[in-house]
C-alpha cells in the first residue's frame, strides 16, 4: 500500500498528490494507479434552513497547501476537525512495537490481496480520462470511506457479511497512471468540490498487472473567485397591497452550493433593513416578497452565501411605492 | 430523465385510509416543492397543497384543509397524499406535479406524474 | 375566494388562430400571477404550456404565445392543428405556493 498519501488544493481546478512508495513491496513497483471522483455535498446541507436563529453556516474548507516536504500530516480526513491545529503526542514503547508489528502484517496481507483478492488483468493500453479497463474485476472489500489511508481489518476479507457502499463503476471513474515518482497533480476539476481519490501501488506492467489495495484520501479543491455572484438582473413586480415580490437567478455553478441569500433593502431617507432568504424559500418564490412597504422610492441589493461565503452584493435595483390607501388586493398572503 | 411516478390505482370503500405516492426520479429531490391536484371525473384541475420534502413544511388550498395529508420521505425521494376516512366524493384522479423547477423562472408547475385514480365506492 | 374564469368551450379551424383567456371574478390578472398554462388531452395528464405569462416551457411550439390583454392572462395558438385539439388549464400564483387553477377550456379544432 501506498504510505501516508496527501492530498492538497492548489487552486479551484486542481489539486496535488503526494505519498510514499510502500515501505515493504512485493517486488519492484512498476507505476502508481491515481484514480478519482467528485463527491456530493451532503444532503442535509440543501435541506437545512439556514436562515433560522442559531444555525451556523456549515464549515467547508479546502486542502490549504503544502508547509513544507514534512508537513504531510495535516491533510485532513473527513472526521478531523478543520480548525484543530493538533500535533502528535510522543509514541509510547507499546506504540513502537505495534508499528512494528503492523509493517510485517501489511506485507503478508499485501500478499495475500496479491493472490486472493485482485483477479490478475491483461495489460492495458494507455492512460486518460475515462478508464479503459473494463476487464479488471475486484471482490467487494467492503467501502473504506473517506479516510487517508485504508487499513484493513477482518471484515474487509471476501467471503464474510461486511455491507459495501456501492460507488460508481471503475470503467466511468478518470484515472492517471504514474510512473517513476510519487506525486500527480490531478488538474480539470471542478471548483469547491470535494473529491476521494484512490492510490495504488503496482509492480507489474505487463502481461498482467498486480495492484496494491487502495489508499484513500479526500481533498477538496478551491473556491472560484466570482461563482458565487448573481448574475443577471434583479426583476421585481409591484402588487396593489404594497407588496414586492424580488426574483433573481440562482448563480449556475457556486462553491459547492447556496444555502441562503441576503436581501438589504432601503427607502430613500431610512436605514437599511436585511432579510435573510433560504434555499427552500427561493425554491418557492424563485425570490422573495417584501411586504407593508411604506410609499417611497427603495433600493435593493441581494447576494448569495454558498458554502465557501459570500459572493458579491448585485448593482442595486430600484422601484417605487405608491400610497394604495388601502386597496383590496387579490393576492392571498 | 427527470420523472415523477405515482403509485397505482385504487379501489376503496367509504370510510377506508388510503395513501398513494409520488416518486422523483432524476433531480434533488428534497430541495423541490411538490404539488398535489385532483382532477374529478369530467372536470377541471383543482390545486390541493404543496410540500417541501427537506423539512416537510406543507400549504393546503383551504378547500382541502382537513381533508387529506400531505407528507413525504426524503429519504426514498417519495411524496404521499393520504385520506383517514375517504368518501364518495374523493373519486379523482390525483396528479403529483414539481413547482417551479430551476428551468423555469417564475411559479409554475413544470413536470407532472401520470396520475393515480383513486374510485370510492361501497 | 378566489374564482379563476375561463371560456368553457371554444372552436377554431386548421390553421386559425384562437385566444383564450383567463379572468378573475373580482379584480384583474396581472403579471404579478405569473399566469401558466397547461393542456391536457384526454387520458393524459397536463403539461405545461407557457410560464410567467408568456414564457414557454422547454419542448412547447411557438406557435402557442401568452401574454396580458387588457385585465386578463391570454394564451394564443396560431395556425391551430388537430393535435391541439384538447382541454386548456390557466393558474394563478397566489402566493406562498399557492395556485388558483381556471375551469378550463375545451378547443375543438373544426
Known amino acids: 500500500v501506498p504510505l501516508d498519501p496527501i492530498s492538497v488544493s492548489n487552486s479551484s481546478s486542481q489539486i496535488i498528490l503526494k505519498w510514499k512508495p510502500p515501505s515493504d513491496p512485493n517486488g519492484n513497483i512498476t507505476h502508481y494507479l491515481v484514480f478519482w471522483e467528485r463527491q456530493a455535498e451532503d444532503s442535509e446541507l440543501f435541506e437545512l434552513d439556514y436562515c433560522l436563529k442559531g444555525l451556523k453556516l456549515p464549515s467547508r474548507t479546502w486542502s490549504p497547501p503544502f508547509e513544507s516536504e514534512d508537513s504531510q500530516k495535516h491533510n485532513q480526513s473527513e472526521y478531523e476537525d478543520s480548525a484543530g491545529e493538533c500535533c502528535s503526542c510522543p509514541k509510547t514503547d507499546s506504540q513502537i512495537l505495534k508499528e512494528l508489528e503492523e509493517s510485517s502484517f501489511r506485507k503478508t496481507f499485501e500478499d495475500y490481496l496479491h493472490n486472493v483478492v485482485f483477479v490478475p488483468r491483461k495489460t492495458s493500453s494507455g492512460t486518460g480520462a475515462e478508464d479503459p479497463r473494463p476487464s479488471r474485476k475486484r471482490r467487494s472489500l467492503g467501502d473504506v470511506g473517506n479516510v487517508t489511508v485504508a487499513v484493513p481489518t477482518v471484515a474487509a476479507f471476501p467471503n464474510t457479511s461486511s455491507t459495501s457502499v456501492p460507488t460508481s463503476p471503475e470503467e466511468h471513474r478518470p484515472f492517471e497512471k504514474v510512473v517513476n515518482k510519487e506525486s500527480l497533480v490531478i488538474s480539470g476539476l471542478r471548483h469547491f468540490t470535494g473529491y476521494r481519490i484512490e492510490l495504488q501501488a503496482c509492480n507489474q506492467d505487463t502481461p498482467e498487472e498486480r495492484c496494491s489495495v487502495a489508499a484513500y484520501v479526500s481533498a477538496r479543491t478551491m473556491p472560484e473567485a466570482k461563482a458565487d455572484d448573481i448574475v443577471g438582473p434583479v426583476t421585481h413586480e409591484i402588487f396593489e397591497n404594497n407588496v414586492v415580490h424580488l426574483m433573481w437567478q440562482e448563480p449556475k455553478e457556486p462553491n459547492g452550493l447556496i444555502v441562503l441569500y441576503e436581501v438589504s433593502y432601503r427607502r430613500y431617507g431610512d436605514e437599511e433593513l436585511h432579510l435573510c432568504v433560504s434555499r427552500k424559500h427561493f425554491a418557492l418564490e424563485r425570490g422573495c416578497r417584501l411586504r407593508g412597504l411604506s410609499p417611497g422610492n427603495y433600493s435593493v441589493r441581494i447576494r448569495a452565501t454558498s458554502l465557501a461565503g459570500n459572493g458579491s452584493w448585485t448593482e442595486p435595483t430600484y422601484f417605487y411605492v405608491t400610497d394604495y390607501l388601502d386597496v383590496p388586493s387579490n393576492i392571498a398572503k | 430523465q427527470m420523472q415523477l411516478v405515482q403509485s397505482g390505482a385504487e379501489v376503496k370503500k367509504p370510510g377506508e385510509s388510503l395513501k398513494i405516492s409520488c416518486k422523483g426520479y432524476?433531480?434533488?429531490?428534497?430541495?423541490?416543492?411538490i404539488g398535489w391536484v385532483r382532477q374529478m371525473p369530467g372536470r377541471g384541475l383543482e390545486w390541493m397543497g404543496i410540500?417541501?420534502?427537506?423539512?416537510?413544511?406543507?400549504r393546503y388550498s383551504p378547500s382541502f384543509q382537513g381533508q387529506v395529508t400531505i407528507s413525504a420521505d426524503k429519504s426514498i425521494s417519495t411524496a404521499y397524499l393520504q385520506w383517514s376516512s375517504l368518501k364518495a366524493s374523493d373519486t379523482a384522479m390525483y396528479y403529483c406535479?414539481?413547482?417551479?423547477?430551476?428551468?423555469?423562472?417564475?411559479?409554475?408547475?413544470?413536470?407532472w406524474g401520470q396520475g393515480t385514480l383513486v374510485t370510492v365506492s361501497s | 375566494q378566489t374564482v379563476v374564469t375561463q371560456e368553457p368551450s371554444f372552436s377554431v379551424s386548421p390553421g386559425g388562430t384562437v385566444t383564450l383567456t383567463c379572468g378573475l371574478t373580482?379584480?384583474?390578472?396581472?403579471?404579478?400571477?405569473?399566469p401558466s398554462w397547461y393542456q391536457q388531452t384526454p387520458g393524459q395528464a397536463p403539461r405545461m404550456l407557457v410560464h410567467?405569462?408568456?414564457t414557454r416551457y422547454s419542448g412547447v411550439p411557438d406557435r402557442f404565445s401568452g401574454s396580458i390583454l387588457g385585465n386578463k392572462a391570454a394564451l394564443t395558438i396560431t395556425g391551430a392543428q388537430a393535435d391541439d385539439e384538447s382541454d386548456y388549464y390557466c393558474?394563478?400564483?397566489?402566493?406562498?405556493?399557492?395556485?388558483?387553477f381556471g375551469g378550463g377550456t375545451q378547443l375543438t379544432v373544426l
Open positions: 410540500i417541501y420534502p427537506g423539512d416537510s413544511e406543507t
Open positions: 410567467s405569462t408568456s
Open positions: 373580482s379584480g384583474s390578472v396581472s403579471t404579478s400571477y405569473y
Open positions: 406535479a414539481r413547482h417551479a423547477p430551476l428551468a423555469v423562472a417564475g411559479m409554475a408547475l413544470g413536470d
Open positions: 393558474a394563478l400564483y397566489m402566493g406562498g405556493g399557492i395556485y388558483v
Open positions: 432524476g433531480y434533488r429531490f428534497s430541495d423541490n416543492w
